[in-house]
């Protein structure tokens, strides 16, 4: 119904009031629910109302506003500290202990986060974004520095329709249009061979507990799995001779693990020769990402941090040990 310039929606009635004509919903059941568009952000609950905008939001602290879009900083709370002596004793031993897997405990001293003690170091959001990996969009964390809110603001739940087929045909130099989508990893760039590469700055250096021959054999699956987490494409970097940069890794000799030496009895020097895994150098190619998304990594720093964040959540499907982002062309060092 309408009266004058006011057009009312389905199920609404027009009521003449002192301040002019207004739309009114006599029975919210019969009207389009204002809640249909999920207007309440940050976990706020939506309640249908009889008058425009036909909803009201009940916000969860620390949010407020008509759509729970406003963040209200709580009175300054002291930063959480890692109180547990247990966690102090267990930090940096190479084993992730969930009781210590918190921001305050530096993710068990990096043991749960691929040795990166603060993946959110560059995140300046007023929200503690590490606590907002919650399957809903938190715009205040939806920045590259805050790791794109774990991609929760752009349909993170989309899955590859023909996943098995697309995995088998990923990066096989044959374009499968059914796999040429973000959720299917853009068919490993098979459909973009004629497009110029768009490399992110830097290199991801990953230690994975798979010997080089096994990793190279499984390279397509490995690159697809990591690319899926980063919502872009990865490739193994080549050295100046054109060789793939995948090297044997002989185990951690850093101070972080001198704390707990390998306990098997071995001849001097023998332990160093045992291949524990691989050190692989990866590049990010955004040629498809930039066409479909504005959430692409311009450099490898935040990409490394996002992988660390996945390690914290326990959602990595490969036995990664560490990840670092190198800005300059690396020398081959072990």
């Amino acid at each position: 119904s309408s009266c004058g310039q006011v057009k009312c929606r389905k199920g609404e009635q027009c009521v003449h009031t002192a301040s002019g004509p207004r739309c009114f919903c006599p029975s919210p059941r019969d009207c389009e629910s204002g809640c249909a568009s999920s207007p309440c952000q940050h976990g706020g609950s939506c309640h249908p109302q009889r008058q425009p905008p036909y909803y009201s939001c009940q916000c969860a602290p620390p949010f407020s506003g008509s759509r729970c879009e406003l963040y209200t900083a709580p009175p300054s709370t002291p930063p959480a500290t890692c109180l547990s002596q247990y966690c102090a004793d267990k930090a940096r031993d190479g084993v992730c202990d969930e009781a210590c897997n918190s921001h305050a405990c530096q993710w068990d001293g990096g043991d749960c986060s691929l040795t990166m003690e603060n993946p959110w170091a560059n995140c300046s959001s007023p929200l503690p974004c590490w606590d907002y990996i919650n399957n809903q969009c938190d715009e205040l964390c939806n920045t590259v520095e805050c790791l794109f809110d774990n991609f929760e603001c752009q349909g993170n739940s989309k899955t590859c329709k023909y996943d098995k087929y697309c995995a088998d045909h990923f990066k096989d130099n044959h374009c499968d249009q059914g796999c040429n989508s973000e959720e299917c990893g853009w068919d490993g760039l098979d459909c973009a061979a004629d497009q110029p590469e768009n490399l992110a700055e830097g290199t991801l250096v990953i230690v994975v507990l798979m010997p080089p021959e096994q990793l190279l054999q499984d390279a397509r699956s490995f690159l697809r799995a990591l690319g899926t987490l980063l919502h872009t494409n990865l490739r193994i970097k080549r050295d100046s001779q054109g060789e793939l940069m995948v090297y044997p890794y002989y185990g951690e000799k850093s101070a972080a693990m001198k704390k707990q030496r390998m306990t098997r009895r071995s001849l001097p020097g023998e332990q160093e020769q045992e291949v524990a895994g691989s050190k692989v150098f990866l590049e990010i190619d955004n040629r498809q990402c930039v066409q479909d998304s504005d959430h692409c990594f311009k450099n490898t720093d935040a990409a490394a941090a996002l992988l660390a964040s996945h390690a914290i959540q326990g959602t990595l499907s490969y036995p990664l040990v560490s990840v670092v982002s190198e800005s300059l062309t690396p020398e081959r060092t072990q």
Epitope: V95, C96, L209, Q260
Partner: antibody, heavy 122, light 107 residues
């Protein structure tokens, strides 16, 4: 097929020592944590110790700390439990069990060996 | 240390019955809980991890629920091969601890 096979159990006198072995096959031994779990006759399960073969990090139950030592030989894909100063209450079937979550002690044990019986008696 | 308390310690049931076993942790363990089945003379077998995820090859009649301190294992329709002892276990922090077990016997 992922498999764990324990050996080394037997009869030992109180105060004596024994070394149990757990041979792993069918997976990347270095990548996954390993625990020893024991079960006294007619009783429930008790976790004993954990090792992450890659880093060599170890964890122990208070009841065995200082007496038992867990270790791993990554070249042999074998975990060990060296048991010293054995007591009657250590009598149990000892199982080795693989953790499902790579470097996480905070993961379930998804593969178990068949167990080896240790009897401590004079 | 985190204590795990299972109830009941034993129960008698018939084939086709719905069986529920509960497990309570002395402090919050989020969803870091597993359920194991053990038959006499055999090693334990993982049934449920993460409080509610079924392990590979486990029949759909087994389900787990709960979070924090209270957890449940449900067998929707008891089969002859399900008569065994069931253990819950927390893996939130070391020392890893088990419940005392629930023996499911034939009525």
């Amino acid at each position: 097929e992922v498999q764990l096979v324990e050996s080394g159990g037997g009869l030992v006198q109180p105060g004596g020592s024994l070394r149990l072995s757990c041979a792993a096959s069918g997976y990347s031994f270095t990548s996954y944590g390993m625990s020893w779990v024991r079960q006294a006759p007619g009783k429930g399960l008790e976790w004993v110790s954990y090792i992450y073969p890659y880093s060599g990090a170890t964890y122990y139950a208070d009841s065995v700390k200082g007496r038992f030592t867990i270790s791993a030989d990554t070249s042999k894909n074998t975990a060990y439990l060296q048991m010293n100063s054995l007591r009657a209450e250590d009598t149990a079937v000892y199982y080795c069990a693989r953790h499902s979550g790579y470097y996480r002690i905070s993961s379930a044990m998804d593969v178990w060996g068949q167990g080896t019986l240790v009897t401590v008696s004079s | 240390d985190i204590q795990m308390t299972q109830s009941p310690s034993s129960l008698s049931a018939s084939v086709g019955d719905r069986v529920t076993i509960t497990c309570r942790a002395s402090q919050s363990i989020s969803s870091y809980l597993a359920w194991y089945q053990q038959k006499p003379g055999k090693a334990p077998k993982l049934l449920i991890y993460g409080a509610s995820s079924r392990a590979s090859g486990v029949p759909s009649r087994f389900s787990g629920s709960g979070s924090g301190t209270d957890f449940t294992l449900t067998i929707s329709s008891l089969q002859p091969e399900d008569f065994a002892t069931y253990y819950c276990q927390q893996y939130y922090s070391s020392p890893l601890t088990f419940g005392q077990g629930t023996k499911v016997e034939i009525k």
